[in-house]
């Protein structure tokens, strides 16, 4: 997830200063030191699921 209102990027992406465009935050898992990863916020917690026997 990206930080709130990451301009001018859509949800799940962050602006790259070097490329001057939005990049997918998912790629930060493989390349965490890319510049735009600074703008990718912590992933939201997984939704709670009730486990039935």
């Amino acid at each position: 997830e990206q930080a709130p209102g990451t301009a001018p990027c859509s949800r799940g992406s962050s602006w790259s200063a070097d490329l001057d465009k939005c990049m997918d935050c998912a790629s930060c898992r493989a390349r965490p030191h890319s510049d735009f990863c600074l703008g990718c916020a912590a992933a939201p917690p997984a939704p709670f699921r009730l486990l039935w026997p």
């Epitope: 990206q2 930080a3 200063a17 070097d18 001057d20 030191h33 990863c37 600074l38 992933a43």
Partner: antibody
């Protein structure tokens, strides 16, 4: 209200270590990158390090790489800077700051600053 | 990032024009104001957008390697040091600063 409160500065001998802390309140800490910036006496601003909201991405100025470590404890809403192998030239006021990705990585909230003096 | 001039001596009511030049092309730039004994304050982000609560006498412009901060009419509280800042190659960098002083 949104604020950053710093602690941990002081006098340390060359080669010594120190850990700075920055406690955040008034905003969703995990949603923001954070940074450390320093200012030597009578000098300009120098960026030191930055970390993403998750803590998974870290960035350092060449002058501190390998000596300083930035980290964050998101459940405690706290940012840290572990400073090792300190040198006289690390003497400065250290500021923590919130980095706004939606402000194209401008820093919009700053701590009050804490003085680190490296001297024998 | 190279800022010029190092010091600008002006009177209240005058226009201040501060320059920031990058060695390589920069896509966006921020500007900060700092007064003695205080933390910096964000004025301009994304080259030309004013941060929250910043009066409209402050404006930013520029592209590529040349950027400008303009204060249209200096107020007494505007006399301070101003820094530009970029983010490039995964490094945040500040300019050396411009001091705006009362002549």
């Amino acid at each position: 209200q949104v604020q950053l409160v710093q602690s941990g500065g002081g006098l340390v001998k060359p080669g010594g270590s120190l850990r700075l802390s920055c406690a955040a309140s008034g905003f969703t800490f995990t949603s923001y990158a954070m940074s450390w910036v320093r200012q030597a006496p009578g000098k300009g601003l120098e960026w030191v390090s930055a970390i993403s909201g998750s803590g998974g991405s870290t960035y350092y100025a060449d002058s501190v790489k390998g000596r300083f470590t930035i980290s964050r404890d998101n459940p405690k809403n706290t940012l840290y800077l572990q400073m090792n192998s300190l040198r006289a030239e690390d003497t400065a006021v250290y500021y923590c700051a919130r980095v706004r990705a939606n402000y194209y990585y401008g820093m919009d909230v700053w701590g009050q600053g804490t003085l680190v003096t490296v001297s024998s | 990032l190279t800022q010029s001039p190092g010091t600008l001596s002006l009177s209240p009511g005058e226009r201040a024009t501060l320059s920031c030049r990058a060695s390589q092309s920069v896509s966006r730039l921020a500007w900060y104001q700092q007064k003695p004994g205080q933390a910096p304050r964000l004025l301009i982000y994304g080259t030309s957008s004013r941060a929250t609560g910043i009066p409209d006498r402050f404006s930013g412009s520029g592209s590529g390697t040349d950027f400008t901060l303009t204060i249209s009419r200096l107020e007494p509280e505007d006399f301070a040091v101003y820094y530009c800042q970029q983010f490039r190659n995964s490094l945040l960098t500040f300019g050396g600063g411009t001091k705006v002083e009362i002549t």
